[in-house]
């Protein structure tokens, strides 16, 4: 029944502080929910590259409502990395779910978006244990860049002034000799 086709909702859940402190490992959990039929492929991407190491995905999607033969499905997957890797705010984690739904040619008359074949993703940025986030990290980089540019500008100005003074001194010397 085409009316019962639904794309997944995808969410990534960050590792718990308890796990990080106790095991020095960090497990990100991806949950794809509410899709039908159960034709999906889930993958993890770290810093733009697909990863397989440390990935554990449910062997198959499970019914949300076991008693219903056309129940929508859920699928979960876990990505385990070292605590230090997770705590680097530059690291970007993405859970991608390829959903095989309707084609452009399939007729659709329902009052919701047509559930076509699509990719649905959710992401997370590494989070340092001292309250750093990717935003605060980027803000820090921006501040450092601005500070560097100010100092560089000051140094350049200083160099120009010194050069001008030296040049002026040399010109004066020449004039006094002549």
């Amino acid at each position: 029944d085409l009316k019962n086709v639904f794309p997944p909702k995808v969410a990534v859940f960050e590792p718990s502080e308890a796990e990080i402190s106790h095991t020095q490992k960090a497990t990100l959990v991806c949950l794809a929910t509410g899709f039908y039929p159960d034709h999906v492929e889930l993958s993890w991407w770290v810093n733009g590259k697909e990863v397989h190491s440390g990935v554990s995905t449910d062997p198959q999607p499970l019914k949300e409502q076991p008693a219903l033969n056309d129940s929508r499905y859920c699928l979960s997957s876990r990505l385990r990395v070292s605590a230090t890797f997770w705590q680097n705010p530059r690291n970007h984690f993405r859970c991608q779910v390829q959903f095989y739904g309707l084609s452009e040619n399939d007729e659709w008359t329902q009052d919701r978006a047509k559930p076509v074949t699509q990719i649905v993703s959710a992401e997370a940025w590494g989070r340092a244990d001292c309250g750093f986030t990717s935003e605060s990290y980027q803000q820090g980089v921006l501040s450092a860049t601005i500070l560097y540019e100010i100092l560089l500008g000051k140094a350049t100005l200083y160099a120009v002034l010194v050069s001008a003074l030296v040049l002026m001194a040399m010109v004066k010397r020449k004039d006094s000799r002549g």
Partner: antibody, heavy 122, light 109 residues
């Protein structure tokens, strides 16, 4: 916000049928499963069955197999529960209750209707 | 399967009360439990879902837990208030059906 509004009280004779409606509003009708639960006077809650409003499939508790029919009308965002061959012990408050899904380990009821009292008496 | 609850419990305001729910087969780790509160003349409302999650609007005085060794779930209400007086039902499911416990009547003395 999500709301389920049920039809009014019914008085029926033994052997008759009753059809209770439950109109949903405040959410995408097709996205939520709908359970029916009943409660006899002074008794606990009893699950009757579930319907998937998008596909229309149903699953009924063994006790009610052959007597209960759950249907839906997507144009009016309404689900129906019809119970046939009524007996006096079917006298109860009948509730519809929705479930948003989203977990394969949890089959619960998020929002409940106000209940419909069905009295079976000769 | 069946879910078994005590018929009634009672406690004084401000105290803590626990209501147990024992599952005859299957387990709450793979098939979560929900808890509903039903005040007289009203529809049930969810106080705990997925073993220990609390819906928004439910005070943190309500908490849920499971004990795998005894295959039971527990609803704990701390700092009891008179408004907590109600019937409480646990609910879970298996592959073919949804099951409610018999209900526990909580009296706040």
């Amino acid at each position: 916000q999500m709301q389920l509004v049920q039809s009014g009280a019914e008085v029926k004779k033994p052997g008759a049928s009753v059809k209770v409606s439950c109109k949903a509003s405040g959410y995408t009708f097709a996205s939520y499963y709908m359970h029916w639960v009943r409660q006899a006077p002074g008794q606990g809650l009893e699950w009757m069955g579930i319907i998937n409003p998008s596909g229309g499939s149903t699953s009924y508790a063994q006790k009610f197999q052959g007597r209960v029919t759950m249907t839906r009308d997507t144009s009016t965002s309404t689900v129906y529960m019809e119970l046939s061959r009524l007996r006096s012990d079917d006298t109860a408050v009948y509730y519809c209750a929705s479930n948003r899904g989203g977990s394969y380990k949890s089959v619960g009821m998020d929002v409940w209707g106000q209940g419909t009292t069905v009295t079976v008496s000769s | 399967f069946m879910l078994t609850q005590p018929q009634s419990v009672s406690e004084s305001p401000g105290k803590t009360v626990t209501i147990s729910c024992t599952r005859s087969s299957g387990n709450f780790a793979s098939k979560y439990v929900q808890w509903y509160q039903q005040r007289p003349g009203s529809s049930p409302t969810t106080v705990i879902y997925e073993n220990y999650q609390r819906p928004s609007g439910v005070p943190d005085r309500f908490s849920g837990s499971i004990d795998s060794s005894s295959n039971s779930a527990t609803l704990t209400i701390s700092g009891l208030k008179t408004e907590d007086e109600a019937d409480y039902y646990c609910q879970s499911y298996d592959e073919v059906s949804v099951v409610f416990g018999g209900g526990t009547q909580l009296t706040v003395l």
